[in-house]
């Protein structure tokens, strides 16, 4: 008889979830030579174990403490790059201006971009059907608890001027339910970080909208200043033009605003 | 003139509810966060709740955590706190204040007094 | 109790320098945001320092600094106008919340 298996509202866990993990950790450290001390096996094991057995609501950032030592990895902290719903410009960005880092380009960010993963309680298995949703079911669940646990530590890392690239296309430019609304702005520590610059990237080859008046940046502006953090804004009014801009920086289209 | 201007205090017995206001002019009310503080006869200042600029983000004090909310109408340009099961202890004069980026809570309105009594 | 300690009063003579203490924690005054109020008899508080810079109209008599998890408020050359009680506030960001301290109450003798 086949037992009774709760039904979570997300989707399950990414299917070969397991060796998708190990791989990206192989692929890691072959290519960063920093972190080729990593024992991709324990990580795995560090990784299952923060989730396998546990009911997948009641996940804690305990759970993934063995993890994080594992993954614990220097990245400059003053190169660190933000984002907020504007992931894949970010990673371009970064892939491009190769000093800089988002959190996917350190290895635990790396090793968990884009998956969805959960067990059960007091079962052994790995639940492929169906995984908690934030926000119909529960936000204490692995994957939520995950990003929670190193986007904090990413931004507690970060010191002189730190970046956020802000999607300029949607309602709220900075929105308080993102991550990086409401983990990371809140875990900049002001005695390292001397400014926050965003960059707020526009959607509309015709948008010449001043974005960084928008009261969601003003918004921003106000946290951060009650932390004695310094605020920055700019409009990146051309977001190919500004790729294009990063690769080839003497190129005399370049000089003027993007 | 920038000015805040408070209204809505009064008599109210312990368990009931007053609606306060605060009417901002003279300066662009829809830029900025801002407060309720409040001082109890003879005591010091208590800071009471905030509001963020577009209404996202609210702040309270733990002394009034479930049964004060505070709201804004930027269209309006008024602040709103809204007291419900009021207390003794609630017993003050209440002032709304802006709060400038980096500055501080640099405009204050004149505050209206909240009296809990039976 | 306030979060922020600051002594209940302080006395000086006119012309003279008082200075009036406020001591908090990581979480406020050594990270974030430090302001003073004055409030005068009978009116509502007025901004008087953010942080260590004055706003615009208050006389440079007044002076602010910051050290570690305490802040202070100096008044130089002392006024008979300068008697009121003094608050210092902080952002909180334990709380997330602004916290004041109990006031001094400022008596020019």
């Known amino acids: 008889v086949p037992r009774w298996r709760q039904q979570w509202s997300g989707p399950g866990t990414t299917k070969r979830f397991p060796e998708t993990v190990l791989a990206r950790c192989v692929k890691y450290t072959e290519i960063h030579p920093e972190m080729r001390h990593v024992d991709c096996q324990s990580v795995w094991d560090a990784f299952k174990g923060a989730f396998i057995s546990k009911h997948p609501c009641n996940i804690t950032e305990e759970d993934y403490q063995p993890l994080m030592k594992l993954g614990t990895q220097t990245v400059p902290c003053n190169k660190i790059l933000l984002w907020s719903r504007i992931k894949d410009l970010a990673h371009q960005f970064t892939q491009v201006q190769r000093d800089m880092f988002t959190l996917e380009d350190t290895l635990l960010g790396y090793l968990a971009d884009d998956l969805t993963w959960c067990g059960e309680f007091n079962t052994s298995k790995i639940n492929y059907q169906s995984c908690p949703d934030w926000r119909k079911d529960c936000s204490n669940n692995p994957v939520s608890v995950f990003w929670k646990t190193v986007s904090r530590r990413f931004a507690e890392a970060a010191c002189d001027v730190v970046h956020v690239m802000l999607n300029g296309s949607r309602s709220k430019i900075f929105d308080k339910n993102s991550t990086f609304g409401s983990v990371e702005v809140h875990n900049l520590q002001p005695e390292k970080v001397q400014t926050l610059e965003a960059w707020v990237i526009h959607g509309g080859r015709e948008d010449s909208r001043d974005l960084c008046q928008d009261p969601t940046i003003k918004e921003l502006e106000s946290i951060i200043s009650k932390r004695n953090i310094q605020f920055s804004c700019k409009n990146i009014y051309r977001p190919d033009k500004f790729l294009q801009c990063v690769k080839n920086p003497e190129d005399s289209s370049c000089t003027s605003e993007i | 003139e920038v000015q805040l201007l408070e209204s809505g205090g009064g008599l109210v017995q312990p368990g009931g509810s007053l609606r306060l206001s605060c009417a901002a002019s003279g300066f662009t009310f829809s830029d900025y966060e801002m407060n309720w503080v409040r001082q109890a006869p003879g005591k010091g200042l208590e800071w009471v709740s905030a509001?963020?600029?577009?209404?996202?983000?609210?702040y309270y004090a733990d002394s009034v955590k479930g049964r004060f909310t505070i709201s804004r109408d930027n269209s309006e340009n008024t602040l709103y706190l809204q007291m419900n099961n009021l207390r003794a202890e609630d017993t003050a004069v209440y002032y709304c204040a802006n709060y400038k980026s980096y500055y501080g809570m640099d405009v204050w309105g004149r505050g209206t007094t909240v009296t809990v009594s039976s | 109790q306030s979060v922020l300690t600051q002594p209940p009063s302080a006395s000086g003579t006119p012309g003279q320098r008082v200075t009036i203490s406020c001591s908090g924690s990581r979480s406020n005054i050594r990270n974030n945001l430090v302001n003073w109020y004055q409030q005068l008899p009978g009116t509502a508080p007025k901004l008087l320092i953010y942080?260590?810079q004055r706003p615009s109209g208050v006389p440079d008599r007044f002076s602010g600094s910051k050290s570690g998890t305490s802040a202070s408020l100096a008044i130089s050359g002392l006024q008979s106008e300068d008697e009121a009680d003094y608050y210092c506030a902080s952002w909180d960001a334990s709380l997330n919340a602004w916290v004041f301290g109990g006031g001094t109450k400022l008596t020019v003798l």
């Open positions: 509001i963020s600029i577009t209404g996202s983000w609210t």
């Open positions: 942080n260590t």
